[in-house]
């Protein structure tokens, strides 16, 4: 187990002519965020294929507004690292996609809008525990500078995070054949308990007795290199003329999966889908109870208190299989409607909605009066592709949810005093004025500029404005 860390140093115009226009403007201020997607191996995979090693989304960067006439500078970046935790061994070779997203902060109805500014991709070799590797990638006229590294989480150490460290049993030195764990010099390597003969360079194990191969190696002891060149025959003996090394039988030939497991080939070797009650690389581990921790990827184990009763793994979002061992590509379902963008955050699926839409799947049209009610007796008014609420007296805000102060606008003229009232406001007029808002002077001869006041209402009495 460990963490892949990505530090973005700068994102801005690349060298050479044709500098890109600033993605933000005074009218449409914006900010950036980044998404990284990691896949094991060096395969040329489509951008849409699942991020099998994991993915991460950065925080939003500071808001940026373009200075008119100025060229687009390096844009302000989010703070902090992007971190992608990995549960299994670090594969040593990996593919990455780094996307730069723009969040527009204009006054669109329904909040901000997102658009992809740039996408860079690459394939790299990287040992865990090594120093930061620096990189520069270009996408069109944009340039992205970044560093990355993979580090192991204790107690794992080594270039693949497969060796384990344990506190020393003796104060001075480690046991026979065991080295101190750099950089944790007060700890010692735990003895490896992989299958006898498992290649120490190309194999690793996560459970006693198994031998799992790193990228590029196969065979029961991970001693057979997998060909990376293209061969005429998909299987068969190695060809001396092409220098092509291909394992003879296919990885699923003879079905290596025990206990009724079904075998499927993978780019790296094979994968067993085990029936409930069995797990392990070849479904060889049986009599499993919840105490054995059979549920992977944070799955919750239920039942199975004894070997005869079956357990059930309740998988977290993004995983499936009887042991939560399979990652689901949930964005392939295309759950986001109305042009929303699907982001698989690992633990959750998020739709980034276009302006004017909202909801878990962007199903809610904010521009549509039919899909939005105005509170407290307000009425919805459509116009120009947007909606607004015309609020009843005493209420305000986008949805008429806020209680408005009817006196805030100082509606009483000529020094009249305003009083809020459940049905509106009341003006108490200064001497010499009358009317609902004290707008009419009382004539010196006693006649007013208004029609005669209703019986019982003297000039200067409070006038209720309804």
């Amino acid at each position: 187990a460990g963490v892949f860390e990505l530090q973005i140093h700068s994102f801005g115009p690349g060298p050479g002519p044709g500098a890109p226009r600033s993605p933000c403007s005074a009218r449409l201020p914006c900010r950036l965020f980044f998404r990284v997607c990691l896949k094991p191996g060096l395969s040329e995979e489509a951008a849409e294929s699942p991020c099998a090693l994991g993915a991460a989304l950065s925080a939003r960067g500071p808001v940026y507004t373009e200075q008119p006439g100025a060229p687009a500078p390096d844009l302000p970046l989010p703070d902090g690292l992007l971190q992608v935790p990995f549960r299994d061994a670090w594969p040593g070779t990996f593919s990455f996609i780094i996307e730069t997203w723009r969040e527009e902060l204009g006054d669109q109805i329904g909040g901000p809008a997102w658009s992809l500014l740039a996408r860079v991709a690459g394939r790299r070799r990287l040992a865990a525990g090594g120093p930061w590797a620096r990189d520069i990638q270009r996408a069109g006229a944009w340039e992205l500078r970044f560093s990355y590294r993979a580090r192991c989480e204790p107690p794992a150490v080594g270039t693949a995070c497969t060796r384990l460290c344990r506190p020393r049993s003796a104060p001075s030195r480690c046991g026979p054949g065991l080295r101190p764990c750099a950089p944790l010099e007060d700890e010692c390597e735990a003895p490896l308990v992989c299958r006898a003969g498992c290649s120490p360079e190309h194999g690793f194990c996560e459970q006693p007795g198994e031998c799992r191969c790193l990228e590029g190696w196969t065979g029961p002891l991970c001693t057979v290199p997998v060909s990376t060149s293209s061969c005429l025959s998909p299987r068969g003996p190695s060809s001396a003329t092409t220098g092509c090394l291909v394992p003879g039988p296919g990885p699923c030939d003879g079905n290596p999966c025990a206990n009724g497991g079904s075998c499927s080939e993978t780019p790296r070797s094979f994968e067993c889908t085990c029936p409930r009650g069995f797990y392990g690389l070849r479904c060889e581990v049986s009599g499993v109870t919840c105490a054995d921790g059979p549920c992977f990827n944070g799955g919750l184990c239920v039942g199975g208190a004894d070997p005869d009763s079956a357990y059930i793994c309740h998988c977290p979002p993004g995983f499936q299989g009887s042991n939560c061992e399979k990652r689901v590509d949930r964005c392939s379902l295309q759950p986001c409607r109305n042009g929303g963008l699907c982001l698989d955050l690992g633990h959750a699926l998020r739709c980034r909605c276009r302006a004017g839409f909202a909801g878990p799947r962007c199903e809610h049209d904010l521009d549509d009066c039919a899909g939005r009610a105005c509170a407290n007796g307000g009425t919805c008014v459509e116009g120009g592709g947007a909606h607004r609420c015309s609020c009843a007296l005493g209420f305000g805000g986008r949805d008429c949810r806020e209680r408005a102060d009817p006196c805030a606008a100082r509606p009483c003229a000529h020094g009249g005093r305003c009083y809020a009232h459940f049905s509106g406001l009341v003006c108490a007029c200064a001497p010499g004025y009358m009317g609902a808002r004290c707008e009419f002077p009382v004539h010196p001869d006693g006649a007013s500029a208004l029609p005669a006041a209703p019986p019982g209402l003297r000039p200067g009495d409070p006038q209720r404005y309804l």
């Epitope: 379902l333 759950p335 959750a348």
Partner: antibody, heavy 118, light 112 residues
């Protein structure tokens, strides 16, 4: 482990206001929408509305538009349901539930019983 | 608003029997772009919160026994329990998440 922990039972007078809370743990609060659902005996489940904690946007069933207000506090990973002008029809169990783009109401709180009585 | 109707409102069966309950929506829940039905089924046992069983009309939630099957498309949907167990005693609700959210009135499953 994902959990939605709701506040305790409430006994309120008719016409009063009540504020129910729903504290999320075990997941990134901002990545999920939080819904509120009302359940009265023999009357099934009624959806009140949702909030997106990332931006505070809330949408309501028009039937609850004047009665309910949903807010969220991302610093404490808590969503709130404010109910106003309560009548005897407000007596119910109120549930919060979380939803992302893939799963509908995958996780539910344990429910809060609100009793409106004079 | 989309109205959800469930039938029957209650039914009593013996352990081991097959059960079918229906849910009908007042408008189609099928989204043409992804050919998915925005419908879920929930189980609510006495004194408990509802629990998600089926989503996208036919996808079984992780950990839900395979005796539960969701089917249907458009406006007509079915939840089938192939062989009822005593622990299946509950009320079953359908819910649309195509627009706003609305639940059916529920089907109460009792064990004879």
């Amino acid at each position: 482990e994902v959990q939605l922990q709701q506040s305790g039972a409430e006994l309120v007078r008719p016409g009063a206001l009540v504020k129910l809370s729903c504290k999320a743990s075990g997941f990134n609060f901002k990545d999920y929408y939080i819904h509120w659902v009302k359940q009265r005996p023999e009357l099934g489940l009624e959806w009140i509305g949702w909030i997106d904690p990332e931006n505070g946007n809330a949408i309501y069933d028009p039937k609850f538009q004047d009665k309910a207000s949903i807010t969220a506090d991302t610093s404490s990973n808590t969503a709130y349901l404010h109910l106003s002008s309560l009548t005897s029809e407000g007596t119910a169990v109120y549930y919060c539930a979380s939803e992302d783009a893939y799963y509908p109401f995958a996780y539910w709180g344990q429910g809060t019983l609100v009793t409106v009585s004079s | 608003d989309i109205v959800m109707s469930q039938s029957p409102s209650s039914l009593a069966v013996s352990v081991g029997e097959k059960v079918t309950m229906r849910c009908k929506s007042s408008q189609s829940l099928l989204y043409s772009s992804n050919q998915k039905n925005y419908l879920a089924w929930y189980q609510q046992k006495p004194g408990q919160s509802p629990k998600l069983l089926i989503y996208w009309a036919s996808t079984r939630e992780s950990g839900v026994p395979d005796r539960f099957t969701g089917s249907g498309s458009g406006t007509d949907f079915t939840l089938t329990i192939s062989s009822v167990k005593a622990e299946d005693l509950a009320v079953y609700f359908c819910q649309q998440y195509y627009s706003y959210r609305t639940f059916g009135g529920g089907t109460k499953l009792e064990i004879k």
